[in-house]
Amino acid sequence: SGTTNTVAAYNLTWKSTNFKTILEWEPKPVNQVYTVQISTKSGDWKSKCFYTTDTECDLTDEIVKDVKQTYLARVFSYPAGNVESTGSAGEPLYENSPEFTPYLETNLGQPTIQSFEQVGTKVNVTVEDERTLVRRNNTFLSLRDVFGKDLIYTLYYWKSSSSGKKTAKTNTNEFLIDVDKGENYCFSVQAVIPSRTVNRKSTDSPVECMGQEKGEFREI
């Protein structure tokens, strides 16, 4: 039968940032196509990306239904042009993904400093509350909505004239820090989920410095 030419998918890998979640696999298809199925541990299988020649499948719509669930996906291989064919055991070839729990494993996207404002010797730094694709009541939730107090931000700040980075932390999206009068400071933030053991931190935000247009200075 034609199935002798189909090969099972391998290297199934979850790629997920701020809950945007894609399953990737190998190999690039030669005379075959793939279909993906996803389910929770206790749920039914749902098919996605039917008979595709891609080696990735966006599963975001499924995992955002409950980001605290653990998901399993599998990739079926079919001969191109003969998708009804099955393997020698009467089943198409398939390979299982590793388990994936979005809440515990999605990567934290690079944060952005929304603004900073100096009032005397205090600076208020605000981090943009990034929107995710997780919905509640037909509304997209922000990262803070989803993670609540599990998510903290670390602010690194330093005088433009020095290299040592001081740190501050918040479980909101705002920092209020003390600065020296007459000094310009630079800022970078990092998202952190301290309760995690893997994927704990985001990459750093772009650096923003006082004297640039994002900030505002008020002498009190």
């Epitope: 903290i152 980075k165 001081k166 740190t167 932390k169 301290p194 053991t197 893997v198 990459t203 750093d204």
Partner: antibody, heavy 120, light 107 residues
Framework: EVQLVESGGGLVQPGGSLRLSCAAS????????IHWVRQAPGKGLEWVGY????????YYADSVKGRFTISADTSKNTAYLQMNSLRAEDTAVYYC?????????????WGQGTLVTVSS | DIQMTQSPSSLSASVGDRVTITCRAS??????VAWYQQKPGKAPKLLIY???FLYSGVPSRFSGSRSGTDFTLTISSLQPEDFATYYC?????????FGQGTKVEIK
């Protein structure tokens, strides 16, 4: 099991240099902050400096600024403390410690310490 | 830098005693205070974090509290293995700073 193991301590003359290592196992250092803390004989704990291995950011105590440098090699899962221009008052047990980077940032795991003696 | 003033510097107590150690921060540190126990020749061990949270595996006779900028470590009933030196630490701002330590000795 989370473990931090310091090495590289020893006897060095004033003005000399020494490099301490802090080898981590059971976790990935790039997900945490690593601090160095020292304790002179019979004295209390003194914070030396930190590194965030994910971005290389550091900060030092005034007492060591310009003389000590903290670095990290994430491929080796190891942090380092390079100590130059050593003085008698740098004599201490040096510990590395992991900062869980939570709001209160406690140092939840510590190494066993390595003794640095600066003497002629 | 924030100063952490710890008292007393030493105390003598008996097994079963209630022991209280205090630390005062020179400015607001919110709840970003930890307490450590250190025995001779050993590394410090975390006991309390965020002012009042008991670290995993630490006996429940240890507790921490906060009142403004004053922080307290209490050992409700001192055990033989509790004779050690105790340090508070703030990490609200950089640099983190330690108290001077309190040595708990056998009376």
């Amino acid at each position: 099991e989370v473990q931090l193991v310091e090495s590289g301590g020893g006897l060095v003359q004033p003005g000399g240099s020494l490099r301490l290592s802090c080898a981590a196992s059971g976790f990935t250092i790039s997900g945490y902050i690593i601090h160095w803390v020292r304790q002179a004989p019979g004295k209390g704990l003194e914070w030396v400096g930190y590194i965030d291995p994910s971005n290389g950011y550091t900060y030092y105590a005034d007492s060591v600024k310009g003389r000590f440098t903290i670095s990290a090699d994430t491929s080796k899962n190891t942090a380092y403390l390079q100590m130059n221009s050593l003085r008698a008052e740098d004599t201490a047990v040096y510990y590395c410690a992991r900062d869980d980077q939570s709001l209160s940032s406690p140092f939840d795991y510590w190494g066993q310490g390595t003794l640095v003696t600066v003497s002629s | 830098d924030i100063q952490m003033t710890q008292s007393p510097s030493s105390l003598s107590a008996s097994v079963g005693d209630r022991v209280t150690i205090t630390c005062r921060a020179s400015q607001d540190v919110n709840t970003a205070v930890a307490w450590y126990q250190q025995k001779p020749g050993k590394a410090p061990k975390l006991l309390i974090y965020s002012a009042s949270f008991l670290y995993s595996g630490v006996p429940s006779r240890f507790s921490g509290s906060r009142s403004g900028t004053d922080f307290t470590l209490t050992i409700s009933s001192l055990q033989p293995e509790d004779f050690a030196t105790y340090y508070c630490q703030q990490h609200y701002t950089t640099p983190p700073t330690f108290g001077q330590g309190t040595k708990v000795e056998i009376k």
